[in-house]
């Protein structure tokens, strides 16, 4: 057999299709849990309509050794125009309170799939 | 101070690749997003990719994502962007330009001039 | 994919008011778009003016302002000077790519 050619790249993913991927991954993970997410973790509570995807992930960026949000935290860093490192926090102009990473993934999904619904894929 | 300096001017026949560099310094390569620009001669800007330096993660426009292919040499602190199949309308000149937060599109090399012409 | 559109040319008088808009074909513009403001002039590389919506850029004049109008990114120019008579791009952030906008020559008249 001979090979005519490489793999064809992949196109970029849709603003849709990247969405609705990350929609259910947050779903995943809600349905998934046992133990509490991420051991109970803290972290900071965001503004869903001001920056929200860079203001996720400065937010969850800092939790470390959970694997349950490795993902997330992945395809979060895909949605940010901008490099996000732990201890960032250019986006989160606001940091007055803290809540469980379970809670945080919880509020995030109903925001996305209130947008999905919306049309609102940008 | 940051700089980003380019590979200079290309001429280059259609069906070719052009491979261009943007070697940086002044700052820490892996510590920023870097993005490419597109502007043909008196015309607008195009958006065509970024990677990440860290991990060599891409993210592509729709319009160029079979022919372009972007990377980074974190040895040489050296991002390069390679466009296939050339034809007469990517003539153009070509940016490299740091992203961050706080300064998006702040610095800018000064730009790789590519003629494609039979 | 989404196109981003700007008024093609506007004109303003030296010390005037200028609005310049982004309009998304997709929807309305939001903070999660992190539009970016540029201005170029001629043989020149762009240069960011306003990032993340309404941020000014370091050394940037504070006679450019950014902001939402109703479903638009805008940039305002408050006080004209001949200097500020250049192309100006927005560019808008869809989840995972940029778009530049068409383009809006200014001119200072």
């Known amino acids: 057999l001979t090979c005519l050619g490489g793999f064809a790249s992949p196109g970029p993913v849709p603003p849709s299709t990247a969405l609705r991927e990350l929609i259910e991954e947050l779903v995943n993970i809600t349905q998934n849990q046992k133990a509490p997410l991420c051991n109970g973790s803290m972290v900071w509570s965001i503004n869903l309509t001001a920056g929200m995807y860079c203001a996720a992930l400065e937010s969850l960026i800092n939790v470390s050794g959970c694997s349950a949000i490795e993902k997330t935290q992945r395809m979060l860093s895909g949605f940010c125009p901008h490099k996000v490192s732990a201890g960032q926090f250019s986006s989160l102009h606001v940091r007055d309170t803290k809540i469980e990473v379970a809670q945080f993934v919880k509020d995030l999904l109903l925001h996305l799939k209130k947008l999905f619904r919306e049309g609102q894929f940008n | 101070e940051v700089q980003l300096v380019q590979s200079g001017a290309e001429v280059l026949k259609p069906g070719a690749t052009v491979l261009i560099s943007c070697k940086v310094s002044?700052?820490?390569?892996?510590?920023?997003?870097m993005h490419w620009v597109q502007q043909a001669p008196g015309k607008g800007l195009e958006w065509m990719g970024r990677?990440?330096?860290?991990?060599?993660?891409?993210k592509y426009a729709p319009k160029f994502h079979d022919r372009v292919t972007i990377t980074a040499d974190t040895s040489t602190d050296t991002a390069y962007m390679e466009l296939s199949s050339l034809r007469s309308e990517d003539t153009a000149v070509y940016y490299c330009?740091?992203?961050?937060?706080?300064?998006?599109?702040?610095?800018w090399g000064q730009g790789t001039l590519v003629t494609v012409s039979s | 994919q989404a196109v981003v559109t700007q008024e093609p040319s506007l004109t303003v008088s030296p010390g005037g008011t200028v609005t310049l808009t982004c309009r998304s074909s997709?929807?309305?513009?939001?903070?999660?778009?992190?539009a970016n403001w540029f201005q170029q002039k001629p043989g020149q590389a762009p240069r960011t003016l306003i990032y993340?919506?309404?941020n000014r850029a370091p050394g940037v004049p504070a006679r450019f302002s950014g902001s939402l109008l109703g479903d638009k990114a805008a940039l305002t120019l408050s006080g004209a000077q001949p200097e500020d008579e250049a192309e100006y791009y927005c560019?808008?952030?869809?989840?995972?790519?940029?778009?530049f906008g068409t383009g809006t020559k200014v001119t200072v008249l």
């Open positions: 330009t740091r992203y961050d937060y706080y300064g998006p599109f702040a610095y």
């Open positions: 002044g700052y820490t390569f892996t510590d920023y997003y």
């Open positions: 990677i990440d330096p860290e991990d060599g993660e891409t």
């Open positions: 997709t929807g309305a513009v939001t903070t999660s778009n992190y």
């Open positions: 993340g919506t309404n």
């Open positions: 560019a808008l952030w869809y989840i995972n790519h940029f778009i």
